[in-house]
């Protein structure tokens, strides 16, 4: 941080290294929950129109993508992934790209990803091709 | 050298007005994704707006969005902030600062990323 710069104890909108050099804030979709038509697709476009400075600098950018018996939804947001969100660990939250894994909840769909670039929760990807977790 | 400089600041009243300035100099500024940042008293950075070098696409913080408008003039190595509908809230400090896109972190603190700052003061 320059020397001008206050820097504030026991905040966390600023994030700084040993050498005192400042992280940027992740740019993310931000679009809450919407109603989505994407299924039965290896990726699908958000189609979220917002894109928001991340208030955080630790902050990813996450979908969560649900189906169940009346509707398909696609929420965008940004977050801590030191927090668990909707009750997950973002365990791919250092991902370049939305990589889609199904999680276990009852009486749904449930898929859930993270990442760590620009925007990257503006494309979700389903296909397997992608994912990095398949003992094949 | 690198140069930062805002301009534009001062003591507003609630659902007032402001425009600030930041001039750059000494580096290439078409190449450098540009912020404003604002650090209220005793408080942590918040990072308000950016703007891409080429394009003009702009992002905002969930609390000025509609309210605050960035833009830049890359023949006058000029960024601007109009900052409408002003709250006590906003009151702060306001710096300009540079980013490569794509590159998460600043070199480091000693390194020419910062304007000096001007102080907005938003009360009746």
């Known amino acids: 941080i320059p020397p001008h710069v206050q820097k504030s104890v026991n905040n966390d909108m600023i994030v700084t290294d040993n050498n005192g050099a400042v992280k940027f804030p992740q740019l993310c979709k931000f679009c809450d929950v919407r109603f989505s038509t994407c299924d039965n697709q290896k990726s699908c476009m958000s189609n979220c129109s917002i894109t928001s400075i991340c208030e955080k600098p630790q902050e990813v950018c996450v979908a969560v993508w649900r189906k169940n018996d009346e509707n398909i939804t696609l929420e965008t947001v940004c977050h801590d992934p030191k927090l668990p969100y909707h009750d997950f660990i973002l365990e791919d939250a250092a991902s370049p790209k939305c990589i889609m894994k199904e999680k276990k909840k009852p009486g749904e769909t449930f898929f859930m990803c993270s990442c760590s670039s620009d925007e990257c929760n503006d494309n979700i990807i389903f296909s397997e091709e992608y994912n990095t977790s398949n003992p094949d | 050298e690198v140069q930062l400089l805002e301009s534009g600041g001062g003591l507003v009243q609630p659902g007032g007005s402001l425009r600030l300035s930041c001039a750059a100099s000494g580096f290439t500024f078409t190449e450098y994704r540009m912020w404003w940042v604002r650090q209220a008293p005793g408080k942590g950075l918040e990072w308000v707006s950016?703007?891409?070098?080429?394009?003009?696409?702009?992002y905002y913080a969930r609390s000025v969005v509609g309210r605050f408008t960035i833009s830049r003039d890359n023949s006058k190595n000029t960024l601007y902030l109009q900052m409408n509908s002003l709250r006590a809230e906003d009151t702060a400090v306001y710096y300009c600062a540079k980013q490569i896109p794509g590159r998460k972190w600043t070199a480091n603190s000693r390194f020419d990323y910062w304007g000096q700052g001007t102080l907005v003061t938003v009360s009746s």
């Open positions: 950016a703007i891409e070098p080429i394009g003009n696409r702009t």
